[in-house]
């Protein structure tokens, strides 16, 4: 005897109570493949979750996180708090970066400022909680008498002849 359920398309379920007739999925449920004997309950995007894609009879709803949070896990199963620039997420919430570290994003950890002296350079712009230091020329380049009276010629763009 042929299983009539295999003929039921996505968006329906095989109703054994009605001689294996294909019945549409009830409201707030779906079946994404054919031949299903039940429809699955639609995911509800509540609280810190917001709806990215509404549930249909053939596909589940898709959730996103509300402003101030970002998705984690498969299919955005979790919402993790964003922090401000200059902070990092700790187990006890968002905390300011310690002195000597920075974070220029809403996620991730505070990272140490670049140590300019390791490259033989000097600090041109001091670092902050939100920004790394900017390294400049080496201290030797900045010493008196090290600079020439005439500035260096500007670099030419390839394919352009001098004016």
């Amino acid at each position: 005897l042929q299983d009539l359920c295999s003929n039921c398309p996505a968006g329906t379920f095989c109703d054994n109570n009605r001689s294996q007739i294909c019945s549409p999925c009830p409201p707030n449920s779906f079946s994404s493949a054919g031949g299903q004997r039940t429809c699955d309950i639609c995911r509800q995007c509540k609280g810190v979750f917001k709806t990215r894609k509404e549930c249909s009879s053939t596909s589940n709803a898709e959730c996103d996180c509300i402003s101030g949070y970002h998705c984690l896990g498969a299919e955005c199963s979790m919402c993790e708090q964003d922090c401000k620039q200059g902070q990092e997420l700790t187990k006890k919430g968002c905390k300011d970066c310690c002195f000597g570290t920075f974070n220029d994003q809403k996620r991730g950890i505070c990272r140490p400022w670049t140590n300019c002296s390791l490259d033989g350079k000097s600090v041109l712009v001091n670092g902050t909680k939100e920004r790394d230091v900017v390294c400049g020329p080496s201290p030797a380049d900045l010493s008196p008498g090290a600079s020439s009276a005439t500035p260096p010629a500007p670099a030419r763009e390839p394919g352009h002849s001098p004016q």
Epitope: T90, K91, K92, I109
Partner: nanobody, 124 residues
């Protein structure tokens, strides 16, 4: 493939107890600290508790201190969370999470693998 599978959630009355388990596979369990993290219906993720790889150091969020106990059985690759004196505000989906290091603390947030979660509902 690294996998974490939680179990033990359910409906419990205020003041009651539950014990959550997390079965780990696909990595050397004893080499990594583990955490429990929860997400209440209207809130983002909240860290609950952490334990070092060897089990010698444990840490708790202030909201669960004295009521919850984290433990692990490295011979069974399993993490536990004993939850006593449960309150309505403990209602959440509870996730176990692998940390990126052997040692842990109550500050650094370095979870890198998460389970699917188990739902705990505290209601009369």
């Amino acid at each position: 493939e690294v996998q974490l599978l939680e179990s033990g959630g359910g409906l419990v009355q205020p003041g009651g107890s539950l014990r959550l388990s997390c079965a780990a596979s696909g990595f050397t369990f004893s080499s990594y600290a583990m955490s429990w993290v929860r997400q209440a219906p209207e809130k983002g993720l909240e860290w609950v508790s952490a334990i070092s790889g060897g089990g010698g150091s444990t840490y708790y969020a202030d909201s669960v201190k004295g009521r919850f106990t984290i433990s692990r059985d490295n011979s069974k690759n399993t993490l536990y969370l004993q939850m006593d004196s449960l309150k309505a505000e403990d209602t959440a989906v509870y996730y176990c999470a692998k940390e990126g290091t052997t040692e842990t603390d109550d500050y650094h947030y370095n979870m890198d693998v998460w389970g699917q979660g188990t739902t705990v509902t505290v209601s009369s």
